[in-house]
């Protein structure tokens, strides 16, 4: 059940989730999706220019329900999906115009989750079962990493120390995580 493509609010198909692993079972199909550029945060990576501010890591807003067995969250949660491609900001498509995908000729660069946040969700269960409150991990920001090989395992290397876009007002709440496929913690373990 991998998602090969989905629509955003600019009505273009973005074939970006096909490379991701199958998402956790409790992820339902996205109900809404819209694109958000990287808020001007430049990831650290030298492509063909020394001006890192020219590069951007695309972030997509993703709204989904969290499920846990037969239970489902009362409300959908919104998080980010990190687009698989990093490139010059001027070439990344925005919500109105259609930019061209830029692909580096050298190493493989990926836009991946960087910081996570935790959010409490109320899970409603069938059959009169009491609601469950659960904390889930949600992607809070993305960054660019370079893909290298390590012991036959894919290993992603940071471009630099900078990384997350600071969140306005307050530091992202301690813990939460997730991956490209995005997140929720799966099966009810109890």
């Amino acid at each position: 059940q991998g998602w090969q493509a989905f629509k955003n609010d600019a009505t273009e198909i973005i074939p970006e989730l096909g490379e991701y692993p199958e998402p956790p079972p409790e992820l339902e199909n996205n109900k809404t999706m819209n694109r958000a550029e990287n808020g001007g945060r430049p990831p650290h990576h030298p492509f063909e220019t020394k001006d890192v501010s020219e590069y951007s890591c695309r972030e997509l807003h993703f709204t989904r329900y969290v499920t846990d067995g037969p239970c489902r969250s009362a409300k959908p949660v919104t998080e980010l999906v990190c687009s698989g491609q990093c490139g010059p900001a001027r070439l990344l498509p925005n919500a109105i115009g259609r930019g061209k995908w830029w692909r580096p000729s050298g190493p493989d660069f990926r836009c991946i989750p960087d910081r996570y946040r935790a959010q409490r969700v109320q899970l409603l269960c069938p059959g009169g079962e009491a609601p469950r409150a659960r904390k889930v991990r949600l992607v809070a920001s993305c960054k660019c990493k370079r893909l290298t090989r390590f012991h036959n395992q894919s290993e992603l290397k940071d471009f630099g120390t900078e990384a997350a876009r600071p969140q306005k007002g307050r530091k992202p709440r301690p813990r939460a995580r997730s991956a490209k496929a995005n997140q929720a913690e799966l099966e009810n373990a109890y």
Epitope: P172, R177, A179, K180, E185, L186
Partner: antibody, heavy 117, light 111 residues
């Protein structure tokens, strides 16, 4: 039932390397974050590293950053910890743990790593 | 960074109730996040006893309960039994990857 079984521990000299494995079964491996936690003899628990669902995001304790690498193979339901430049203070029992809803609901039995000359 | 502080040891007699505290300190968080408690018997792996401050996984006795007030979380064990003698660790999460932070551990002795 959920099972996590660590292996790969042993005696290694300072500066040496070791690779730990954690074989998982009884649950949907690719759907969980996983962590390594260690416990030095007579000491408390210390989180070492964690990894997200597909291995794209990894995090490390400052004490091991740059020396340890966590990875996972979802096709083999296995978690790894590559430990390089080992030091005496890395001597500990290393546990792998399954992370669900921001806590560790299942742990392996642990594997002992001894760094000594 | 968040740091969690626990008493090194507590003790009680069978049938009594005891409480283990876990106090959080942080430069940026006024009160600690959701806390979990783990029990560890000598030579064994830790076992989850309480999660999200006051929830018990199935199979854990209802003699174990958790609570939180401000930046201090507490684990209470009522009707103390000999098999409760173990080390207890509180934990929460912190950092960009929401990584686990453990308290120093508390040794519970059943007299």
């Amino acid at each position: 039932q959920v099972q996590l079984v660590e292996s790969g521990g042993g005696l290694v000299q300072p500066g040496g390397s070791l690779r730990l494995s954690c074989a998982a079964s009884g649950f949907t491996f690719r759907s969980h974050w996983l962590s390594w936690v260690r416990q030095a003899p007579g000491k408390g628990l210390e989180w070492v590293s964690n990894i997200n669902y597909d291995g794209s995001s990894t995090y490390y304790a400052d004490s091991v950053k740059g020396r340890f690498t966590i990875s996972r193979d979802n096709s083999k339901n296995t978690l790894y910890l590559q430990m390089n430049s080992l030091r005496a203070e890395d001597t500990a029992v290393y546990y792998c743990a399954r992370d669900t809803y921001l806590h560790f609901d299942y742990w392996g039995q642990g594997t002992l790593v001894t760094v000594s000359s | 960074d968040i740091a969690l502080t626990q008493p090194a040891s507590v003790s009680g007699s069978p049938g009594q109730s005891i409480t283990i505290s876990c106090t959080g300190t942080s430069s940026d968080v006024g009160d600690i996040n959701d806390v979990s408690w783990y029990q560890q018997h000598p030579g064994k792996a830790p076992k989850l006893m309480i999660y999200d401050v006051n929830n018990r996984p199935s199979g854990v006795s209802n003699r174990f309960s958790g609570s939180k007030s401000g930046n201090t979380a507490s684990l209470t064990i009522s009707g103390l039994q000999a098999e409760d003698e173990a080390d207890y660790y509180c934990s929460t999460y912190d950092g960009p990857g929401l990584s686990e932070v453990f308290g120093g551990g508390t040794k519970l002795t059943v007299l």
